[in-house]
């Protein structure tokens, strides 16, 4: 039978290429059975993950899975980095894999690097 543990389905080593100035929604897919867990987002700073307290979040409920969404309205250059969601469930902390946002500054949008370039040359991010 299917586990009733909470599971957070952010893909391991997932990455997103986004443009500063655009809106963006970062989704944390959450599977739970009865009571929806308390979920939070944090941003990695070295080995610590700093909780994002004052950011707009929302839930999107679908048939077999729910999404806890972190809203970027708009994306800013310093949103670049790695994020993780975590859930409190029966006094256990469940952490997702981290997901990385590569933000290209709108000022250089005309010469915006491709997703391929950013994957192979992440130092292009702050041109």
């Amino acid at each position: 039978k299917e586990s009733c543990d909470v599971q957070l389905y952010i893909k391991r080593q997932s990455e997103h290429s986004i443009l500063a100035g655009d809106p963006f929604e970062l989704e944390c897919p959450v599977k739970y059975c009865a009571n929806r867990p308390h979920v939070t987002w944090c941003k990695l700073n070295g080995t610590t993950c700093v909780k994002l307290e004052d950011r707009q979040t929302s839930w999107k409920e679908e048939k077999n899975i729910s999404f806890f969404i972190l809203h970027f309205e708009p994306v800013l250059p310093n949103d670049n980095g790695s994020y993780r969601c975590s859930a409190n469930f029966q006094s256990n902390l469940i952490e997702s894999h981290s997901t990385t946002l590569y933000v290209t500054d709108v000022k250089s949008a005309s010469e915006r690097p491709s997703k391929d370039e950013m994957a192979s040359r992440p130092w292009l991010l702050y041109r």
């Epitope: 389905y9 893909k11 997932s14 290429s17």
Partner: antibody, heavy 120, light 112 residues
Amino acid sequence: EVQLQQSGAELVKPGASVKLSCTDSGFNIKDTYIHWVTQRPQQGLEWIGRIDPANGFTRYDPKFQGKATITSDTSSNTAYLQLSSLTSEDTAVYYCAREDGYPYYTLDCWGQGTSVTVSS
Amino acid sequence: DVVMTQSPLTLSLTIGQPASISCKSSQSLLDVDGKTYLNWFLQRPGQSPKRLIYLVSKLDSGVPDRFTGSGSGTDFTLKISRVEAEDLGVYYCWQGTHFPRTFGGGTKLEIK
């Protein structure tokens, strides 16, 4: 039972391009990653790269950057590998493989392979 | 890039003999999540590769328990307790921890 169905063999001329397809009949490709792997005649396996079909983000082995382009179409549950400026060195079998996602993240299912022969 | 070095290149064994294949990586394959993404695949003649073992030691469904995977960090081993005819082919290790992903060069198992 085959879940990853690849397009048929290709015979192409040097300098041309070719686009190979890989359709997943058993899984929504948005929920996973699709990888491409090559095998030259009588040689070992080499990883080309992977795509996240949910957002199109790709990763490549640097030695295939510029040679290979991986794309996907979630409406048809299909991933593609385009190879450009083909030479005899690109004669090989090309496999797609699915990464099975949470919690194991390994290549659990492979296509049957597409043979590409580059010859004038 | 992480270099995966397999040995031996070829194993020529009779049915019933044990087999051992080594795979060494040039960097630790322990990921930040505490898991080690080291996998073993078997490619039988004329076929696509097939996953045998994932996360160092977990057997894929349908893989006989005469296969075992072990190791940690940079040193890994695939063992077959008693080789059978259906085991012939080329065995590859693969790391899924670092980019770019890399395969070992392969070990060909021949049946004498």
